[in-house]
Interface confidence: low
C-alpha cells in the first residue's frame, strides 16, 4: 500500500539500528572509496531526517522516493569528480536513470587493500570502547569490497561478529578464541558474497524470469511437500527481495525479506515440517536459517515424472495452452524429486525438455518424438556426476593446496591470457570446493560442487568483462549462466596462445617470503606456478611437479639458513637454471 513518506515507513518497519546499518551498506556499496567517517556522517543525516518524517509525514521532502533522497545525499559529497571520475556524471541525471547509473559504476574488484584483521587485544579494546562504531567499520569495509553483498545477510554476519567479540573479549586467551571463530564467519561471508553476486548477475543479464526459475528449482528441492502454487508464491516473493537488493533498494529488500520469513513461519503447514527451529529465532537469525534450512522429507508416493510429462496424451496441448506454467510445473516436479541434483543441472534439464517440446510438438507424431526425452537427460546428468567424482578423488589424493595447484595449471592452460592474480584467485576459490563439498554425504556433493563452481566462475566472468583478453573465457561467459560451468570444464589448452618468454625476475625470490603467513606464501608459489605454465603451456604434470618440488625445497632450505639473504641470492639463480632445463 502507498505511504505518504517512504522513508518514515521503512524507518518504522526496520527500527533505527537496522535502518542505519542498511543505509551505511547502501552508501558504502555505491561510493566504494569514501572513508567510514564520511559515510557515517551521511548516515546520521539521513537517520535524523527519517526521524523528522516519522514525527510528521507531511514535513518538507518526506514524500520523496528513497532513490531521490539517497542520490541527492551522494551527489552532495565534496570532490566527487576528483575521487570518482565519471561516476560524478550520474549526478546530472534524473531518477530512475541516476540510480541505474550508480549501479553501473559499482566495481566488483575495487583497488582497496585487503581487509586486515587487527590483532586480538587491539580489536577487543576498540570493540569495548564503542561497539556501534566498531560494527559500523565492519559493515563499511565489507560492503565497499563487495558491492552486491546481500544487505540483510551482511547485518546477520555483523551480528555474528558482535556475538563472537562479546564472548571472546571476556576470555583470557582472546586470540585463540577469536581466530577460528572469525575465520569461520569470514569464510561463510565470502561464499555468501559470490553466491549473491551470481543471483544479481542472473537478474541483470537474463531478467526476473531466469531468477524465478532458479528460485522454483531451489525451493522445490527444499520444500518437496509444498504445492506448486505455494512454491510459485515463495519464488515470486524471493525474486522481489533479490531484485530489490541487487538494485540497491536495500531498505525495501530487508523489509520484504522479513515479511517473507514471517509468511513462511506462519504457513509452515503448507511449506515444510523443518522450519520450526528457524522460526523460533530472532529476525536476522531466522531469515538466515530459513535460507539454508535442510530439505524436507520427500513425499513417499510421488508418481513417476513420465506420467504427466511424457505419457500424458495432452502434453503438447498443455504446453501450448500455458508454456510458462507447464514448464514451471515440470521444473517443480523434477526438482522436488531430485534434491541430489544441482540447481544448474535442473535448469539445464528443463531447458532440454522445453527444446524437445518446441521441436516435437510441431511434428506429425509428437509422442513418438518426445517419448525418449527422459532418456536423453542421461548424458546431461552423467557429466556433472563424473566431474564431482574425478575432482573429489583428486582432492582426496592431493589435499586442498595440491588440488588448487592442479586447478591452477588446468585453468592457466585453458586461458593463459588472463592475468596471473585473477587465475590464482580463481584457482584458490575453485580449489576450496574440495574442502567445502567433497566431505559431504554422496547425495549432497553434486549440488554443493556445481552450484559453488558456478558462483566462482561468475566472478571470473565479471573480472574478465572489465578487461577481456581470452576468446575462450569470452565464449563461456557469453552463454547462459547454467551452461557456463560445463563450458569451462570442456575447454582445453588454448592453441592460439603464444607462450610468454622466460623472465628470470619472475622466478626470483627474496628472504622476505620466509616471514609471510602460510596463505601469502602459497599465493607466491601459485603465482610462480601460473607463470611457469604461461611460459610452457604444454608442460607435463611431471615436469611441473619436478619444478615445484624443487622450488619448495629451495624455499625450505633458504628459510632455515643462518644467512637467508646470501642463500636466496646464490641458490636462486641455480633454481632458475634448473627450472629452465626441466621444462626444456
Amino acid at each position: 500500500e502507498a505511504h505518504k513518506s517512504e522513508i518514515a515507513h521503512r524507518y518504522n518497519d526496520l527500527g533505527e539500528q537496522h535502518f542505519k546499518g542498511l543505509v551505511l551498506i547502501a552508501f558504502s556499496q555505491y561510493l566504494q572509496k569514501c572513508s567510514y567517517d564520511e559515510h557515517a556522517k551521511l548516515v546520521q543525516e539521513v537517520t535524523d531526517f527519517a526521524k523528522t518524517c516519522v514525527a510528521d509525514e507531511s514535513a518538507a521532502n518526506c514524500d520523496k522516493s528513497l532513490h531521490t533522497l539517497f542520490g541527492d545525499k551522494l551527489c552532495a559529497i565534496p570532490n566527487l569528480r576528483e575521487n570518482y571520475g565519471e561516476l560524478a556524471d550520474c549526478c546530472t541525471k534524473q531518477e530512475p536513470e541516476r540510480n541505474e547509473c550508480f549501479l553501473q559504476h559499482k566495481d566488483d574488484n575495487p583497488s582497496l587493500p585487503p581487509f586486515e584483521r587487527p590483532e586480538a587485544e587491539a580489536m577487543c579494546t576498540s570493540f569495548k570502547e564503542n561497539p556501534t562504531t566498531f560494527m559500523g567499520h565492519y559493515l563499511h569495509e565489507v560492503a565497499r569490497r563487495h558491492p552486491y553483498f546481500y544487505a540483510p545477510e551482511l547485518l546477520y554476519y555483523a551480528e555474528q561478529y558482535n556475538e563472537i567479540l562479546t564472548q571472546c573479549c571476556a576470555e583470557a586467551d582472546k586470540e585463540s578464541c577469536l581466530t577460528p571463530k572469525l575465520d569461520g564467519v569470514k569464510e561463510k561471508a565470502l561464499v555468501s558474497s559470490v553466491r549473491q553476486r551470481m543471483k544479481c548477475s542472473s537478474m541483470q543479464k537474463f531478467g526476473e524470469r531466469a531468477f524465478k526459475a532458479w528460485a522454483v528449482a531451489r525451493l522445490s528441492q527444499t520444500f518437496p511437500n509444498a504445492d506448486f502454487a505455494e512454491i510459485t508464491k515463495l519464488a515470486t516473493d524471493l525474486t522481489k527481495v533479490n531484485k530489490e537488493c541487487c538494485h540497491g533498494d536495500l531498505l525495501e529488500c530487508a523489509d520484504d525479506r522479513a515479511e517473507l520469513a514471517k509468511y513462511m513461519c506462519e504457513n509452515q503447514a503448507t511449506i515444510s515440517s523443518k522450519l520450526q527451529t528457524c522460526c523460533d529465532k530472532p529476525l536476522l537469525k531466522k531469515a538466515h536459517c530459513l535460507s539454508e534450512v535442510e530439505h524436507d522429507t520427500m513425499p513417499a508416493d510421488l508418481p513417476a515424472i513420465a506420467a504427466d510429462f511424457v505419457e500424458d496424451q495432452e502434453v503438447c496441448k498443455n504446453y501450448a495452452e500455458a508454456k510458462d506454467v507447464f514448464l514451471g510445473t515440470f521444473l517443480y516436479e523434477y526438482s522436488r524429486r531430485h534434491p541430489d541434483y544441482s540447481v544448474s543441472l535442473l535448469l539445464r534439464l528443463a531447458k532440454k525438455y522445453e527444446a524437445t517440446l518446441e521441436k516435437c510438438c510441431a511434428e506429425a507424431n509428437p509422442p513418438a518424438c518426445y517419448g525418449t526425452v527422459l532418456a536423453e537427460f542421461q548424458p546431461l546428468v552423467e557429466e556433472p556426476k563424473n566431474l564431482v567424482k574425478t575432482n573429489c578423488d583428486l582432492y582426496e589424493k592431493l589435499g586442498e593446496y595440491g588440488f588448487q595447484n592442479a586447478i591452477l595449471v588446468r585453468y592457466t592452460q585453458k586461458a593463459p591470457q588472463v592475468s596471473t592474480p585473477t587465475l590464482v584467485e580463481a584457482a584458490r576459490n575453485l580449489g576450496r570446493v574440495g574442502t567445502k563439498c567433497c566431505t559431504l554425504p554422496e547425495d549432497q556433493r553434486l549440488p554443493c560442487v556445481e552450484d559453488y563452481l558456478s558462483a566462482i566462475l561468475n566472478r571470473v566472468c565479471l573480472l574478465h568483462e572489465k578487461t577481456p583478453v581470452s576468446e575462450h573465457v569470452t565464449k563461456c561467459c557469453s552463454g547462459s549462466l547454467v551452461e557456463r560451468r560445463p563450458c569451462f570444464s570442456a575447454l582445453t589448452v588454448d592453441e592460439t596462445y603464444v607462450p610468454k618468454e622466460f623472465k628470470a625476475e619472475t622466478f626470483t625470490f627474496h628472504s622476505d617470503i620466509c616471514t609471510l603467513p602460510e596463505k601469502e606464501k602459497q599465493i607466491k608459489k601459485q603465482t610462480a606456478l601460473a607463470e611457469l605454465v604461461k611460459h610452457k603451456p604444454k608442460a607435463t604434470a611431471e615436469q611441473l611437479k619436478t619444478v615445484m618440488d624443487d622450488f619448495a625445497q629451495f624455499l625450505d632450505t633458504c628459510c632455515k639458513a643462518a644467512d637467508k639473504d646470501t642463500c636466496f641470492s646464490t641458490e636462486g639463480p641455480n633454481l632458475v637454471t634448473r627450472c629452465k632445463d626441466a621444462l626444456a
Epitope: 506448486f228 502454487a229 504427466d308 496441448k317 500455458a322
Partner: nanobody, 128 residues
C-alpha cells in the same frame, strides 16, 4: 457430492492477518477447482480467489491481489485462504466453493463461475 466446511473467520483489526480453511469431504477432492467467494451485507456475492484442481494455477480478484493467497493441501483435502493486510472493506461472510473439472487440463486457470458445491460460510469482520 462434496461437502465443504469453512473455519477461521473472526473479528480482527485493520492490517492484521487471518487464515481461512475449507475442509472437503465426499468425492475425490483432487478433481475439483476450489474457490473462495464473499458476500458483504446488502451486496452480491463476489469472487475472491480460486485454485485449479492440481494446485498449478491461481486467480484473484484485483482488489485482493498481493494481499490474499490461496493454496491447497491435496493430502488433507483442504484449501486455505491466507489474508494479509486486511481492510475494513474485506468484512464479509466468506464461502468456500468447488466445481467439478470438465475436460480442462491441469494447467487451465480455475474458473470464476460455475461452482456447484458451497460451504455454509464463515464471518470475517475487520474493524478500523
Amino acid at each position: 457430492q462434496v461437502q465443504l466446511q469453512e473455519s477461521g473467520g473472526r473479528l480482527v483489526q485493520a492490517e492484521d492477518s487471518l487464515r481461512l480453511s475449507c475442509a472437503a469431504s465426499g468425492r475425490t477432492f483432487v478433481s475439483y477447482d476450489m474457490g473462495w467467494f464473499r458476500q458483504a451485507p446488502g451486496k452480491e456475492r463476489e469472487f475472491v480467489a480460486a485454485i485449479n484442481w492440481r494446485g498449478y494455477t491461481t486467480d484473484y480478484v484485483d482488489s485482493v491481489k498481493g494481499r490474499f493467497f490461496i493454496s491447497r493441501d491435496i493430502a488433507k483435502s483442504t484449501v486455505y485462504l491466507q489474508m494479509n493486510n486486511l481492510k475494513p472493506e474485506d468484512t464479509a461472510v466468506y464461502y468456500c466453493a468447488a466445481r467439478q473439472m470438465s475436460g480442462s487440463s491441469r494447467y487451465s486457470p480455475p474458473g470464476r463461475v460455475g461452482y456447484d458445491f458451497w460451504g455454509q460460510g464463515t464471518q470475517v469482520t475487520v474493524s478500523s
